[in-house]
């Protein structure tokens, strides 16, 4: 039996460190300190990346893509940190690197792993084409590819198509859903599992509502408490279909505060807003507003869709003027 | 004083394995790093590796990986190296040597030799 | 991995000469370098490290210079005990690599 004072060598030790795009990280190194130190990162064993030694920084031999990105926490070298900061990391950073620190009695190898995710907020856009209707769930850019899946009324569908394009760093992914006809709501749920970050969109469709011309019409907007967090920023916007596109009528921002409101008609209850319910009247309905209404409530971990079709049919008066 | 005494001379056939011993004294054994280096009859120093008592990763040459396995048992202030799958080019002294990136202290060497 | 190339592999020198050996880094080593001697039979003994601190207890006719890629070894009175072979090394970095070594003997 080993006494417990004894170990094997390990070549070196291992860590992994995850990073975002263009954000700064850090490389964790730490040795016994003493005197003397020199302290050397590399990428891939054989690319320079940061140079220290007799108490300064030697980067003339620093490859040119760390130039001035790179730094060590001076004023802990004493105390042991080899730590180096690391700025605006992007995706051809990803890799093993290497920190050797020598001292006048230790020599100590550590070597760390860097992954880099790019996660850009996802959107869910609700469109019309022709007779069909579709909702698409889309992100810009990710790294590395997502997890995308659909549920209908809290079931997963198995259908899942994925329109994917890849640049040089990263996927821009479309997931679109053809609903044409359906009643049922619809959850789309984006997953970066290297970031652990997860994005849901969720789309709900209100029974149609028919009111007469002159009347008033209230939209409910409430968000779902499983996704909602009030302490999160988030906007809500208010939009009416019109043939094929949308136009925005009116828009609050969580941040801020703010309303901004680009129809007269709309009339927003700041005493709701406060309790997190973004229901909205339209007043004196003409022919014209007869169309889908759309609120919007999304930050960075959701997107929450409902739409209300609206009717506005001719009043009494009007038709028999005609 | 500082003091490193290795095991004795062997002899070894090729495929076979090797352990040489480096008892220390005179010195706080988990501060320094111990390396190993050989050296070829009639050639030049070759570093192996190090390894740290204390833990932290150590450093090794490439070219013995997979090959050399280097241990400790601080309760004895000794550290260890065991070179595998020897070739009559392994034939040489191995030195222990402590310190960081220079070596301070020396054993006296352990001649292992290889010959079928 | 850095290359040591050491000059001369021998020479022939008299008690009381100046003895200097040159010892060229294959890349700029930021005078991480360090000098030992070693005697037949035995292990080496560190005389100098970064590139010109004598070791406790080496005497003051051992010294060392140089910068960049380029180091030398000076004994600038040679004595009956200096006879033996010199390796330089940089500590610059890992694998730490030796010169070939240098045999200083008697003429």
């Known amino acids: 039996i080993f006494p417990l004072a004894f170990f094997i060598y390990v070549p070196m030790n291992e860590q992994i460190v995850i990073g975002r795009l263009d954000e700064d990280i850090i490389l964790p190194s730490s040795f016994e300190r003493g005197s003397e130190v020199v302290i050397h990162w590399k990428y891939q064993d054989s690319y320079k990346v940061h140079s220290y030694y007799k108490g300064s920084d030697h980067l003339e031999s620093q490859d040119p893509r760390y130039a001035n990105r790179t730094s060590l926490f001076y004023n802990e070298i004493q105390n042991g940190n080899a730590s180096l900061f690391f700025r605006r990391v992007s995706l051809l950073d990803e890799g093993i690197y290497t920190c050797y620190v020598g001292t006048a009695i230790q020599v100590i190898t550590n070597k760390v792993v860097l992954k880099v995710g790019v996660f850009l907020t996802p959107v869910m856009k609700y469109e019309k084409r022709n007779t069909n209707s579709f909702l698409i769930c889309s992100v810009l850019s990710v790294y590395p590819r997502p997890i995308i899946t659909w549920k209908m009324d809290n079931t997963p569908i198995s259908e899942n198509n994925m329109e994917e394009t890849g640049s040089l760093d990263s996927f821009s992914i479309n997931s679109p859903l053809n609903i044409t006809g359906s009643n049922s709501s619809y959850e789309c749920t984006i997953e970066n599992s290297l970031l652990k970050q997860t994005w849901t969109g969720r789309w709900t469709m209100k029974d149609g509502l028919h009111k007469m011309q002159s009347e008033h019409v209230s939209l409910s907007c409430q968000p779902v408490n499983d996704y909602f967090s009030p302490n999160q920023d988030f906007k809500v916007t208010w939009s009416r279909m019109k043939s094929g596109t949308f136009s925005v009528l009116a828009y609050y921002l969580s941040s801020s505060q703010n309303t901004i409101i680009n129809e007269s008609r709309f009339s927003w209850n700041k005493e709701l807003i406060n309790q997190s319910d973004f229901s909205m009247n339209l007043m004196d309905l003409n022919l014209s507003d007869s169309g889908e209404y759309l609120c919007n409530i999304s930050s960075d971990e959701y997107t929450l869709l409902t739409i209300h079709t609206v009717h506005v049919e001719p009043s009494q008066e009007t038709a028999s003027h005609n | 004083q500082v003091q490193l005494v290795q095991s004795g001379a062997e002899v070894k056939k090729p495929g076979a394995s090797v352990k040489v011993s480096c008892k220390t004294s005179?010195?706080?054994?988990?501060?320094?790093?111990m390396h190993w280096v050989r050296q070829a009859p009639g050639q030049g120093l070759e570093w192996m590796g190090g390894?740290?008592?204390?833990?932290?990763?150590?450093p090794y040459n490439q070219k013995f990986k997979g090959r050399v396995t280097m241990t400790v048992d601080t309760s004895i202030s000794t550290a260890y190296m065991e070179l595998s799958r020897l070739r009559s080019d392994d034939t040489a002294v191995y030195y222990c040597a402590s310190g960081g990136y220079y070596f301070d202290y020396w054993g006296q060497g352990t001649l292992v030799t290889v010959s079928s | 991995d850095i290359q040591m190339t050491q000059s001369p592999s021998s020479l022939s020198a008299s008690v009381g000469d100046r003895v200097t050996i040159t010892c060229k880094a294959s890349?700029?080593?930021?005078?991480?370098v360090a000098w030992y001697q070693q005697k037949p039979g035995k292990a080496p003994k560190l005389l100098i490290y970064?590139?010109?601190t004598r070791h406790t207890g080496v005497p003051s006719r051992f010294s060392g210079s140089g910068s960049g890629t380029d180091y030398t070894l000076t004994i600038s009175s040679l004595q009956p005990e200096d006879f033996a072979t010199y390796y330089c090394q940089q500590h610059y970095d890992t694998p730490f690599t030796f010169g070939q070594g240098t045999k200083v003997e008697i003429k």
């Open positions: 970064w590139a010109f």
């Open positions: 005179g010195y706080t054994f988990t501060e320094y790093t």
């Open positions: 890349q700029d080593v930021g005078t991480a």
């Open positions: 390894i740290n008592p204390n833990n932290y990763g150590a």
